[in-house]
């Protein structure tokens, strides 16, 4: 049985059917639903047999329907159901508001029933204008949305409907006026160069699409300057103005077509930078150095002019980078003075010329030459030369003979000394001595040198010869050896030689107790360091014993007799007699005479008495051989 | 019999010092002239300096005056030498000799290493 | 010059005689003295004055001179004499001490 049908509204565009039936009896139902006054077409449905209810959407609203419904059992319909119903009222947007306005935007809040509507209709349009309005849709779940890109300080009317398929609900309107565009902050220079500038802004961020800057010389008609800038910027350096000039800088913001009111700031540029505290001084004998100071980075390059102040006509230009503070200028004449002129060039500008006079100084010299501590193989150099000047001294040796080859010696510009060593002794020499400069060469200066011989021992002389030594005497340089040794050795080789070791300071050497006539030689070498010279050499005879000789008798009395005797003359210091007699019987009788004599009278004698006699000679206190002889006093 | 020892050689920058030694034994060491001599590595022999025996007189090659000085000490039998300002040119073995008043040096040591780098 | 100058090298047959000579001024005033040294080892003194030989040197040692040359023979040359020779003199006050440059004694 079917049976119990219900019909309810289900919001404004739809109606619910409910109803009852046994269970798995109907294969479907169908249903159609008609407006009331019939004035569409039924609409109908098939529906599954195993279905209690069903909703029919897409209907119209506040509209009455008939809805009939029956059951299809193996082909059979059962008897229809009917009954009426009515859909609900349009659902209405609730209050509209503008939430939050700007100077280009406002926040737009509504209410409307949940799930009523697909989209809405926005419309913005400016009042007492005739301009298009702006149009737009948001997604029906939405209750608020922005509007921007609006003007600033400009009525505005909205509009909003919500819409559902074929259905527009009544709009609801709200007039608003937009703010007015935000004012720029303060706008200063921070910084003013004889060129440039630089200007610094405030304003809130994020508000301006760009800047506009306009750099007008105060109280000119010429063109302005104009400059767009990025709206994100706060800070603007102006380059290319000129120096010492008063200008008005003005800005304003814009965005979207809007411009603020504009700022304004009035600056005058600095003066020209100057160039300032030219020095010139000398550097060595062919140079200056010129320092001046200037502001950085200011200048594009110096022009420098170097004049002899005696010489219009030659003048020498250099131009040099900006950056530099400091030149060397080489090349120039010794001990000349100079006219240096500077100035600067800033794009194109030249600023006052500068100039300074200065000489250079006297060309470098070399004197003094001096040689000093000659050995026999060195010696030392030394000079006077200018400081600071000279890379390298040469010096050339010369024999003044010119038999040995030329020897050449370069050295340090720092050195006044040289030390010149394997040279030969005893050589006479020539030294050169010249100074190099960069650019220059002094002129030579010459001085003479003999190296010492070596040192010498010679001249060995034997004097004083004396039967029992001599002396021996040499030459020798002085300082020059250790020691002396001195060798005696008897011609025949038959006794040990003597060796006397004697100071290096000694020149002599007195030998005693050598036997007497016979042959020696003498040899004399120098010790130095242990290195003993070749020997100096002498062969000499002592002389022979001094002889007293030709004892005689004569003149015989009977109390003495006469003696008479020969003597090498010269020798001997005296002579002593011996008398005794020859039995024994009476005391000797010494006499002692003086070296002259010759003979001598002895008196006092026994008669007829026979006497032996000896006699000697004693020189430098040594005894001659004894003569002696046998005499008889006569008779009485 | 005659020995001769030197010590304190080894490596040293230029510019530095060293003090050589010699010890000396077998023989009247107060009685001696005593010397140095050296050889730089492959060379030949350079006489460096002497001393007279009671240490009043001493002598240098021109190559080394002014920088090195020697000395001795006889109650200790011992010769020195004190280098200083020492340069490359410096490296060498050094050997101690004595030589007696009328002899070149007779008795040597067998030296001490020098070496003069950085 | 005030050096004084020795051959590099010389070298002689086993048994054989060889003279080994140096030049120099001071030759003329002083004798030379001569040095034997083998490698790794300290000098030592074979000839000095005139031609004297300190003791336990071989007498197959001699010396001599003449004007500004001075000469080591070595009359017999052994195997064991292979070595550096160095002669060595006096200058004077101011170069107490010189010496050559050195021979290389090789015997072959």
């Known amino acids: 049985e079917l049976e119990n049908l219900t019909v309810t509204e289900v919001g404004w565009d739809g109606l619910r059917l409910n109803w009852t039936a046994a269970d798995q009896a109907y294969e479907h139902f169908i249903i159609q639903v008609q407006e009331a006054n019939k004035v569409e077409a039924a609409r109908n449905l098939t529906v599954p047999g195993s279905l209690r209810a069903v909703d029919i959407p897409g209907l119209k609203a506040a509209t009455p329907y008939t809805v009939s419904i029956y059951g299809v059992i193996q082909g059979y319909r059962t008897p229809v159901l009917s009954a009426e119903a009515s859909t609900g009222e349009t659902p209405n947007l609730g209050e509209v508001v503008v939430a939050e306005v700007g100077w280009d935007a406002l926040k737009l809040n509504w209410t409307a029933p949940e799930g009523a509507y697909e989209y809405f209709f926005i419309q913005v349009q400016e009042a007492d204008t005739v301009e298009a309005a702006q149009n737009l849709t948001v997604p029906g779940g939405l209750r608020s949305t922005d509007l921007p890109g609006l003007k600033a300080a400009t009525h505005y009317t909205i509009t909003i409907r919500g819409v559902t398929q074929d259905f527009s609900t009544t709009p609801l309107s709200v007039e608003v006026l937009t703010e007015e565009v935000p004012d720029m902050g303060n706008l200063t220079v921070t910084e003013v160069s004889w060129d440039a500038l630089r200007l610094n802004w405030t304003t809130p961020d994020g508000t301006y699409d760009q800047f506009t800057i306009q750099v007008q010389e105060a109280d000119q008609v010429e063109e302005a300057h104009n400059l767009t800038v990025p709206g994100s910027l706060r800070s603007m350096e102006i380059p290319g103005l000129r120096a010492g000039t008063p200008y008005t800088v003005t800005l304003h913001g814009e965005v979207r077509g809007h411009s603020t009111r504009p700022l304004a700031v009035e600056v005058v540029t600095e003066d020209l930078p100057q160039l300032g505290d030219l020095a010139v001084s000398e550097v060595g004998w062919d140079g200056l150095r010129l320092n001046w100071t200037a502001a950085d980075n200011a200048y594009e390059h110096f022009v420098i002019q170097v004049q002899e102040v005696n010489k219009v006509e030659a003048a020498q230009n250099l131009t040099l980078p900006g950056s530099l503070r400091a030149v060397d200028i080489p090349g120039l004449e010794a001990a000349t003075p100079y006219r240096v002129s500077i100035y600067g060039v800033i794009r194109g500008y030249r600023t006052p010329v500068l100039s300074a006079e200065a000489s250079t100084a006297k060309e470098p010299e070399i004197g003094n030459l001096n040689v000093s501590d000659i050995t026999p193989e060195s010696f030392n150099l030394s000079w006077m030369a200018t400081d600071g000047i000279f890379e390298t001294f040469t010096i050339e040796i010369i024999d003044s003979n010119r038999l040995l080859e030329t020897v050449e010696y370069n050295i340090s510009g720092a050195e006044r000394t040289a030390h010149i060593s394997g040279l030969p002794p005893s050589t006479d020499f020539i030294v050169y001595l010249s100074g190099l400069a960069p650019s220059i060469r002094t002129k030579t200066i010459s001085a003479t040198a003999t190296t010492e011989a070596l040192p010498l021992l010679e001249n060995l002389t034997i004097s004083d010869i004396n039967p029992y030594g001599f002396t021996v005497s040499w030459m020798a340089s002085e300082n020059a050896f250790d020691s002396f040794l001195v060798t005696v050795v008897d011609s025949g080789k038959l006794l040990d030689p003597q060796e006397f070791t004697l100071s290096g300071t000694q020149r002599k050497l007195e030998l005693r107790g050598l036997i007497t006539g016979i042959g020696y030689e003498v040899m004399v070498s120098g010790f130095t360091q242990g290195h003993q010279t070749k020997p100096l050499r002498a062969e000499i005879v002592t002389e022979a014993e001094p002889e007293v000789d030709n004892l005689l008798v004569s003149d015989a009395t009977p109390d003495g007799f006469r003696l008479s005797w020969t003597a090498d003359e010269g020798v001997f210091d005296n002579f002593v007699l011996k008398i005794r007699d020859t039995k024994k019987q009476s005391e000797p009788l010494e006499i002692t005479l003086l070296a002259p004599e010759r003979t001598r009278d002895i008196t006092g004698l026994r008669e007829a008495t026979e006497y032996e006699i000896e006699l000697y000679g004693i020189s430098k206190g040594r005894r001659s051989q004894t003569v002696s002889a046998i005499a008889t006093t006569a008779m009485g | 019999e005659v020995q001769l020892v030197e010590s304190g050689g080894g490596l040293v920058q230029p510019g530095g010092s060293l003090r050589l030694s010699c010890a000396a034994s077998?023989?009247?060491?107060?009685?001696?002239?005593m010397g140095w001599v050296r050889q730089a590595p492959g060379k030949g022999l350079e006489w460096v300096s002497a001393?007279?025996?009671?240490?009043?007189?001493?002598y240098y090659a021109d190559s080394v005056k002014g920088r090195f000085t020697i000395s001795r000490d006889n109650s200790k039998n011992t010769l020195y030498l004190q280098m200083n300002s020492l340069r490359a040119e410096d490296t060498a073995v050094y050997y101690c000799?004595?030589?007696?008043?009328?002899?070149?040096?007779?008795?040597w040591g067998q030296g001490t290493l020098v070496t003069v780098s950085r | 010059s005030s050096e004084l100058t020795q051959d590099p090298a010389v070298s002689v047959a086993l048994g054989q005689t060889v003279r080994i000579t140096c030049q120099g001024d001071?030759?003329?005033?002083?004798?030379a003295s001569w040095y034997q040294q083998k490698p790794g080892q300290a000098p030592v003194l074979v000839i000095y004055?005139?031609?004297s030989r300190p003791s336990g040197i071989p007498d197959r040692f001699s010396g001599s001179s003449s004007g500004n040359t001075a000469s080591l023979t070595i009359t017999g040359a052994q195997a064991e004499d292979e070595a550096d020779y160095y002669c060595?003199?006096?200058?004077?006050?101011?170069?107490?001490?010189?010496f050559g440059g050195g021979t290389k004694l090789t015997v072959l």
């Open positions: 000799a004595k030589h007696p008043p009328h002899r070149p040096f007779d008795y």
């Open positions: 077998g023989f009247t060491f107060s009685g001696s002239r």
């Open positions: 001393i007279n025996e009671e240490g009043g007189q001493t």
């Open positions: 001071s030759l003329r005033l002083y004798y």
């Open positions: 004055g005139k031609s």
């Open positions: 060595n003199s006096s200058h004077g006050p101011r170069r107490p001490v010189v």
